[in-house]
Interface confidence: low
Amino acid sequence: RGVFRRDAHKSEVAHRFKDLGEENFKALVLIAFAQYLQQCPFEDHVKLVNEVTEFAKTCVADESAENCDKSLHTLFGDKLCTVATLRETYGEMADCCAKQEPERNECFLQHKDDNPNLPRLVRPEVDVMCTAFHDNEETFLKKYLYEIARRHPYFYAPELLFFAKRYKAAFTECCQAADKAACLLPKLDELRDEGKASSAKQRLKCASLQKFGERAFKAWAVARLSQRFPKAEFAEVSKLVTDLTKVHTECCHGDLLECADDRADLAKYICENQDSISSKLKECCEKPLLEKSHCIAEVENDEMPADLPSLAADFVESKDVCKNYAEAKDVFLGMFLYEYARRHPDYSVVLLLRLAKTYETTLEKCCAAADPHECYAKVFDEFKPLVEEPQNLIKQNCELFEQLGEYKFQNALLVRYTKKVPQVSTPTLVEVSRNLGKVGSKCCKHPEAKRMPCAEDYLSVVLNQLCVLHEKTPVSDRVTKCCTESLVNRRPCFSALEVDETYVPKEFNAETFTFHADICTLSEKERQIKKQTALVELVKHKPKATKEQLKAVMDDFAAFVEKCCKADDKETCFAEEGKKLVAASQAALGL
């Protein structure tokens, strides 16, 4: 079967059930439903999934049976619209059910909530989890899929199956270990952190497709795959880009069965053709399907062919540049991006896209000029400042990170970003700035050649979190502007923002700075978040506070927490010393 060249099927649901198998079919339908109806109880979703599965089985037995010819959107949408409490739980989302496909599915997609009002997932004791795992493994794993999917409505579904497989493996191994906790907890921490990162990366892909269109996503994919597979010819890269775009369009559009099926086909194609793609794929291609797909997605860049010829010959010196550009603009720009990216694994994808955009803009201008060649002859000179800007920024920030360490580096970013966009909610500023700060430990350890792709492409993912959270409740025109004007210039746009002089400082509220003994029982991470929340609030009250003033207040605050957590009567200490701290802080900041 050629990749994505399928015969017409009488029953799409039967076709996908047969392709994916019952286990994956059920898991993917559960993910799809949980990503759409994020507030529904687990048991309700399981019931819906079982009903859909039984129906699919009847269609496998007889593809001509009643309703088997309906599209998956129709079948799944009809099923979601049977939920009795739709209006009470989801409000206007219930209006989607009055629409016909494809508008109904589009309506459901628009109501996906990136920040659903759901309780924080609390990890039970290890023995409790192991008992639950042994009592009913299937339900335990379904619950994992459900809880992740409803909190991350754009999580890449086939990748979530891979996470679930690792989750199961962790419990299978560790629940029979001598020290269950020592075995299991690090594995769960790793899965949690990797899962959050995977969710954020996929969210950017979906934002790219949904907000900026297929062309933007394809450009990103050409650049990234050309870096990863520099020996693959342009046609091969382009084919992979076309297929990858289809996969992600499907997943971002809620077509999870098609997405998972097509991702499996793409992995199969890549492995069958690895000789013409990359020498780094051999190990990946020996793995089972889910591991194989994950491995391919994360595979290291192949070695660049040595001494590739100068780009100038085809893209600057050739007299046919404008003719070729006019004949097939996207192909020509795609070739430019491919050729540039395969030569520059040391550049971030967003930088490569900025260079391609500059090249495109220059050709648009110059190919209409009297002497096109004279006009575009110096186009590569325009690239220099674009390359130097992220290089310098990364150098400065890595130096700062190395001086301060992660926590204090995050605090510096908290202050910086709160001053830029003080209207943004404190939890969002804390979450985004903490993640921005993680760029230090993630990327600064790398040699120069790997720093920029690591740092700037990671920052794109984090800033997209800010953009999607802000889109839900827009409060800052500056954030809206940076998020919507250009996908590839988001980071430079935020970097260029200065202190918002129009911001009216927040009224001082002592309650914001009142702390209790419960802070002493928090983990180090949660304690940091409390302190960082206070820091953001301080800046919102006093945007013109200097670094020194803020540092003094934060040092006093840290000492206050440490002192009271050691006290016999912690609560009294927090009450009395807290009042003193608030007064001293107000005085220090001139509030």
Epitope: K231, E233, F234, A235, E236, S238, K239, E272, N273, D275, S276, S279, E303, P305, A306, D307, L308, P309, D320, K323, N324, E327, A328, V331, G334, M335
Partner: antibody
Framework: EVQLVQSGAEVKKPGESLKISCKGS????????IGWVRQMPGKGLEWMGI????????RYSPSFEGQVTISADKSISTAYLQWSSLKASDTAAYYC????????????WGQGTLVTVSS | QSALTQPASVSGSPGQSITISCSGI?????????VSWYQQYPGKAPKLIIY???KRPSGVSNRFSGSKSGNTASLTISGLQADDEAEYSC???????????FGGGTQLTVL
């Protein structure tokens, strides 16, 4: 100056083995694919296969798979085409070409090696 | 049996224009313009004259031009000259095994 220089003409008997060569100079030999092309008397050109000397990644056109072996020695910038057992139908001119960018674009060619197989 | 189809021969008088067609270009090769044209004199090696459908390598006369429509590529030679008499072959990306294919070749005769 980029050059591809092929070994001289060969006259062989059916069943004999043969290895012809193509030496590249004037460019980084490991950076470009090398393709081999057959042209039987009075006939058109046929791509036989390609090799990337940098890592000896080799691919064959379906009709030549198993019939010939393509190899390269990057230490002496030379690509090879060999037969383990020649047939009369292997009589042809064989060309090597440097492939630039995509595999359908041969920008520099060897002068050709004429192979005659006759009993 | 070539995957690309060319007329066996074409002819034209000096100064005229002629066009040689090459049909059977795969959709993949077509969408990314992966078609080349070669000129070959008897007993000599082929010479690249057009690549990526329309591009001419440096040193190739601008009388040679390439184009494509659907799954057919074309080579046009304008202002025909006596020394254009040669065999012309198209070549294109063949798909998954990543080895190109040639057309059967077209003999151009300048009358």
């Amino acid at each position: 100056e980029v050059q591809l220089v092929q070994s001289g003409a060969e006259v062989k008997k059916p069943g004999e083995s043969l290895k012809i060569s193509c030496k590249g100079s004037g460019y980084s030999f490991t950076s470009y694919w090398i393709g081999w092309v057959r042209q039987m008397p009075g006939k058109g050109l046929e791509w036989m296969g390609i090799i990337y000397p940098g890592d000896s990644d080799t691919r064959y056109s379906p009709s030549f798979e198993g019939q010939v072996t393509i190899s390269a020695d990057k230490s002496i910038s030379t690509a090879y085409l060999q037969w383990s057992s020649l047939k009369a139908s292997d009589t042809a001119a064989y060309y090597c070409a440097r492939l630039h960018g995509v595999v359908s674009r041969g920008d520099y060619w060897g002068q050709g090696t004429l192979v005659t197989v006759s009993s | 049996q070539s995957a690309l189809t060319q007329p066996a021969s074409v002819s034209g008088s000096p100064g005229q224009s002629i066009t040689i067609s090459c049909s059977g270009i795969s959709s993949l090769a077509g969408s990314y313009n992966l078609v080349s044209w070669y000129q070959q004199y008897p007993g000599k090696a082929p010479k690249l004259i057009i690549y990526e459908v329309t591009k001419r390598p440096s040193g190739v006369s601008n009388r040679f031009s390439g184009s494509k429509s659907g799954n057919t590529a074309s080579l046009t030679i304008s202002g025909l000259q006596a020394d254009d008499e040669a065999e012309y072959s198209c070549s294109s990306y063949a798909g998954r095994n990543a080895v190109a294919v040639f057309g059967g070749g077209t003999q151009l005769t300048v009358l």
